[in-house]
Structure formats: C-alpha cells, structure tokens
C-alpha cells in the first residue's frame, strides 16, 4: 500500500498526474459511513468543497484525492476532513520546463562516491497499474535498458556516470496518454579519504578474573562511518548464554572519523570461560584489526608475564 | 569487484516473518564467515547474525531464538529467517562478510515494523 502524504509543503510540476493521500486512511476504512469532505482554500476563495463535479480532472477515491493532470491553477491549500480528523496541505504548482526533459526545481540530488554502489530504480508504486511503459534517460538522451516496467541502472560508480538521470512513465487514464517524470542529479566524488581502522591498546590482554564473578571487556577503535566492531567466539561450540554484546558508543573525533567502544560482558564466569579467545574485530572494506581477550584465574596469575596482563 | 545484493525486505506487523536473501558474487564464497548486519536510523551498523564457513550459526541477544541464519554455498547466498519481529527490528540490512575485510556495502534491504 501506498504511504500517505505526510508532507505538509508539496512542490509538483504543472501536466503530470498527481494525488495526496490523507494519513487516516485505516481508520476511514472501518468508518464507511463517516462523512469525508476534501476542500481547497486560495486566494480570495475559502474552503471550497471539492467533488468530481468541481473539475473534470479531479477523482475521488477512498483515502485519495486524484488530479488528472495537476495544473498550474491547482496552487492552493487542501484540507480532508473527518469527524474530528483533519489534514492540511499547501500545494505548489510549478511550470513545466518546455526545452527539457525535466524541470530544474524538481530534481532530487545525489551524490556518490566513485567505486561505491551506484544505483537508479525507476519505480512508480500509486501508478504502478496504469503504468503502460517506463523510460530511463541520462541528460535527456534516451537509454536503452532490458526491462521497459522498470528500468534500473545497478554499478559500481565511475565518475562517467554523472548526470541527471530522468525516469518517465507513461501510462494512460480515460483515453488520454500521460507521464510522471522523476529526475537525480547524480555527482560522482572522490573516495571520500578513509582510515583503515584500528583497536586501541594491546593485540593480547589477559584478563584476572575469579569463577562466579562477572567481568567486562573493553574494546575501543578508530573507524570510519561504515565500519563495523564486533566480537566473536565460541566458533566451534554456538552461543553462551552468560555472555552479552553491549550496545556499541561512538564519538565524533575533531578530523571526522569515529572512536568507537564496544564492551562483552561475561557473568557467572566458569571454567568453560577460561583461557578461550574473545576476540573483538573492527572492520572495513580497506582491511581489519583483531585484539584478543584471555580470561585467566586468579591464582594461575603468577605464570603470566607481568607486560601481557591486563586488569 | 564482490557484488552484494540483498533482497527480501518489506513492510510487516509486529510478529509476522520474512525472509531475507542474499546473493554474492564471488566464486570462492564458501570460505567465508558470512554475516547479516543491520542499521537502524540514527544508530550504527550491528552485526546481528553470522555463520561459519562450517555452518555454525552466531546471533547478537536480541535475535536470538528468533532469527534463524543459514546459507547455501552452490548458490552463493546467504538468508536470514525472521520471525516474531518486533518494533526494534525495523532497519536496512545488509549481509557481508565477518571476520575479514568487508567487501563492498550492497544496498541493502528495508525492513519496516509497523502496526
């Protein structure tokens, strides 16, 4: 089901077919027989009513008020009411740009790092029945893709891939032919310059600790946005009930990159705890790092090298 | 380039199920721990469930008991079983690699939790 319109403040280009769906559409539909009333307000006019009747390109439908197409003297406020329910939207109609494919002040920005995941999905779900074809052009020139329902670009970004990508459906509705156009502006930048990302503090630490009690081990990084720390072990045997993730803090560093801490706590420790491998990874498409925890008893403490322990 | 495409995702009420796939391009894909992560708005990305080239499945405390992570090496995908889903649970998820370098993010898959 299509989501309802929740944006208050709605730009539209003048000759496409447009809609607003009001937000209590679950609620109209177990209220059959509640009156609904959709109006319009501009200028000097106050809350007309609006019904089939106003205009020909106008339809109503349940939760939808249909506008086939959308014109320049649409510019106004609309209001659906129910009982006590009522939504308000202020709607801008703009004109269509005759000397291209798509109009400037409707264009949606994007901007994506080369080598990154690039993708365009033509997708159009209110009009999706209607919808007789779909084309996908790249600064107004036509591509020629497969799939004509919903064309789809899915890359790895170059920066040739720059430019404004339109994607048109046609579709038709009482015997008249129109379309709905949705443009990206697609900027190609530099591989935005990542750390490979590092743990803090020992690659090997030995924990003190005495069976029963609890203990929590630290893990702390320097990481880019997208990277990811976790812990891993007990690879052979599953999951131990006694042991959590806790949930993972990070802090903005002044140059933009991230520390991040990321803490296991094991209670009730037991002998199936000891002398095994926590190991805490920070990860990155550019490369890993790994320290590992040993938790060792108390009393076997004596055989550990003072330079290898941790408390 | 590895290509990660996730798929799956879609619109649910809380307790309903849905299974999440994941396909890789990469030939020697069965030597890999592979892993589901997850990112809510305005959080970090989680690994939420992982599973060994062994087929040992791992899963983070919140899944647990109700998410079930598998993996088929012939078709170089990995799915995600998720039932009982909860309010919580509502992310874009992404399957990679754990353990190693990540390849490179897919786009992901939305999954929205919602009464």
């Known amino acids: 089901a299509e989501s309802c319109t929740s944006r208050p403040h709605i730009t539209v280009v003048e000759g496409e077919p447009f809609y607003l769906k009001h937000c209590s559409c679950s609620l109209a539909h177990e209220i059959e027989t509640t009156t609904k009333s959709w109006y319009k307000s501009s200028g000097s006019q106050e809350h007309v009513e609006l019904n089939p009747r106003s205009s020909s390109r106008i339809a109503l439908h349940d939760c939808v008020l249909e506008f086939w197409p959308v014109e320049l003297n649409d510019t106004g406020s609309y209001f659906f009411q129910m009982k006590n329910y009522t939504q308000k939207w202020k709607l801008n109609v703009i004109r269509r740009n005759k000397h291209s494919c798509f109009t400037e002040r409707q264009v949606t920005s994007k901007i994506v790092e080369v080598k990154k995941f690039f993708q365009i999905t033509c997708e159009n779900s209110y009009y999706q029945t209607l919808v007789n074809s779909t084309s996908l052009y790249k600064n107004c020139k036509k591509l020629l893709l497969e799939n004509n329902k919903n064309p789809t670009i899915k890359k790895n970004a170059e920066f040739e891939d720059q430019g404004y990508y339109s994607c048109v459906h046609f579709l038709h509705h009482n015997g008249k032919l129109f379309n709905i156009t949705k443009t990206f502006n697609i900027t190609i930048v530099e591989d935005r310059s990542n750390i490979v990302p590092v743990l803090l503090g020992p690659k090997l630490n030995h924990v003190a600790v005495e069976l029963g009690k609890n203990v929590r081990l630290n893990c702390s990084a320097l990481l880019n946005e997208e990277d990811v720390i976790y812990w891993m072990f007990g690879e052979e045997n599953g999951s131990d009930p006694n042991i959590h993730e806790e949930k993972e803090m990070r802090i903005m560093t002044p140059e933009g990159k991230w520390h991040a801490s990321k803490v296991l706590r094991i209670e009730n420790i037991g002998e199936s705890n000891l002398n095994v491998l926590y190991n805490c990874t920070v990860a990155s498409t550019g490369g890993t790092d790994t320290k590992s925890f040993i938790l060792v008893r108390k009393a076997d403490m004596a055989d550990i090298p003072g330079h290898v322990f941790t408390r | 380039d590895v290509q990660l495409q996730e798929s799956g995702g879609g619109l649910v009420q809380p307790g309903e199920s849905l299974r999440l796939s994941c396909t890789a391009s990469?030939?020697?894909?069965?030597?890999?721990?592979m892993g589901w992560y997850r990112q809510a708005p305005g959080k970090w990305r989680e690994l939420v469930a992982r599973?060994?080239?062994?087929?040992?499945?791992h899963y983070a405390d919140s899944v647990k008991g109700r998410f079930t992570i598998s993996r088929d090496n012939a078709k170089n995908t990995v799915t995600l079983q998720m039932n009982t889903l909860q309010f919580e649970d509502s992310a874009v998820y992404y399957c990679?690699?754990?353990?190693?370098?990540?390849?490179?993010w897919g786009q992901g898959t939305l999954v929205t939790v919602s009464s």
């Open positions: 990679n690699t754990v353990g190693v370098a990540l390849w490179a």
């Open positions: 599973i060994t080239s062994g087929g040992i499945p």
């Open positions: 990469r030939s020697d894909f069965s030597r890999y721990t």
